[in-house]
């Protein structure tokens, strides 16, 4: 999925939270050097997803996917690509 | 780099009011079941998390956005 290419660690953390997978959340948080209080905070968010069940996780995942693939984001990605191409061309 | 629309969604989830967050979600997915779910999750997070927790969650997000993996 294109959205994960823009900031893979964000989507790793988001889907670990939303899926209720504490182990994957811990691993993802290690990758960004999260402190213990930061881990505790993220696990409180995770608890909300777990308590509200599978449908809740699916629906919120759908929202995140929809936002990430919206014209607001895809337009941004295209614009960034254009800017990168301009810079690369100028750099030659 | 993270898309600003995603960043806004996450920021409102943590720091906005339930109405502000649901309004933001509605711009992208206006299904009643989705909006009800968004409100339930937002209310849960507000009930569970102290202001300090929210600051810590925002700190994690900052680490994510500035990570080489983003």
């Amino acid at each position: 999925v294109k959205m994960a290419e823009t900031c893979p660690i964000f989507y790793d953390v988001f889907f670990a939270v939303a899926n209720g997978n504490e182990l994957l959340l811990d691993l993802s948080l290690t990758k960004v050097n999260a402190t213990e209080p930061e881990r505790t905070a993220m696990k409180k968010i995770q608890d909300c997803y777990v308590e509200n069940g599978l449908i809740s996780r699916v629906l919120d995942g759908l929202v995140m996917t929809t936002i990430s693939s919206s014209k607001d984001c895809m337009g941004e990605a295209v614009q960034n690509t254009v800017e990168d191409l301009k810079l690369n061309t100028l750099g030659r | 780099e993270i898309c600003p629309a995603v960043k806004r969604d996450v920021d409102l989830f943590l720091t906005g009011t339930p109405d502000e967050y649901v309004e933001q979600v509605a711009q992208y997915k206006a299904l009643p079941v989705v909006l009800e779910n968004a409100r339930i999750l937002k209310n849960c997070v507000d009930a569970k998390m102290t202001e300090e927790d929210k600051e810590n969650a925002l700190s994690v997000l900052d680490k994510i956005y500035t990570s080489p993996l983003c």
């Epitope: 209720g20 997978n21 504490e22 182990l23 994957l24 811990d26 691993l27 948080l29 213990e36 | -």
Partner: antibody, heavy 118, light 107 residues
Framework: EVELLESGGGLVQPGGSLRLSCAAS????????MSWVRQAPGKGLEWVSS????????HFADSVKGRFTFSRDNSKNTLYLQLSSLRAEDTAVYYC???????????WGQGTLVTVSS | DIQMTQSPSSLSASVGDRVTITCQAN??????LNWYQQRPGKAPNLLIY???NLETGVPSRFSGSGSGTDFTFTISSLQPEDIATYYC?????????FGPGTKVDIK
Amino acid sequence: EVELLESGGGLVQPGGSLRLSCAASGFTFSSYAMSWVRQAPGKGLEWVSSISGRVGSTHFADSVKGRFTFSRDNSKNTLYLQLSSLRAEDTAVYYCARSRGAAYFDYWGQGTLVTVSS
Amino acid sequence: DIQMTQSPSSLSASVGDRVTITCQANQDISNFLNWYQQRPGKAPNLLIYAASNLETGVPSRFSGSGSGTDFTFTISSLQPEDIATYYCQHYDNFPFTFGPGTKVDIK
């Protein structure tokens, strides 16, 4: 001082079952993910499984998936690895290890030997 | 699954020598790599985490470097107690895998 003490190893026939335990002390057990790593005689290290601290999310190596189960009792500071449908290639020393941040095995037990043979 | 390779598989060096071991991943793992020492008949011991961070209590003669797919572990001045097998391990994602190990002994 952090201590991890494995038990439950022994000789078992192919197809048989065994339950390994790991008693932990010297740290806040529920705050840490934990793992099992095994080492076949004369061979290298192989990660087997990890479990998260509070809710017990687990991941397994493909080689043991569907045959091993990993659980923890935070009230007893104890881990359990249930081994079933055992094969000769499961013969190894099984180490339990503390997994800091679910990523670094920073403390290890002394290991318990599991031998699968007829 | 990510494969880890190590070289050499074994080496002999004199006390005081600088010893270097390399570890290679078959895909980019950023700096998500640890190094362990296992002395004969003992459990492994964490030396280096996140490619270059020295674990608390580990002598400063041990160091690690690298990022992406290529990593290096160095003992700046080999001591008799460093006789052991050294393993790298990635934590990019599950399943975690270890390198096959490098056996170090004294000439």
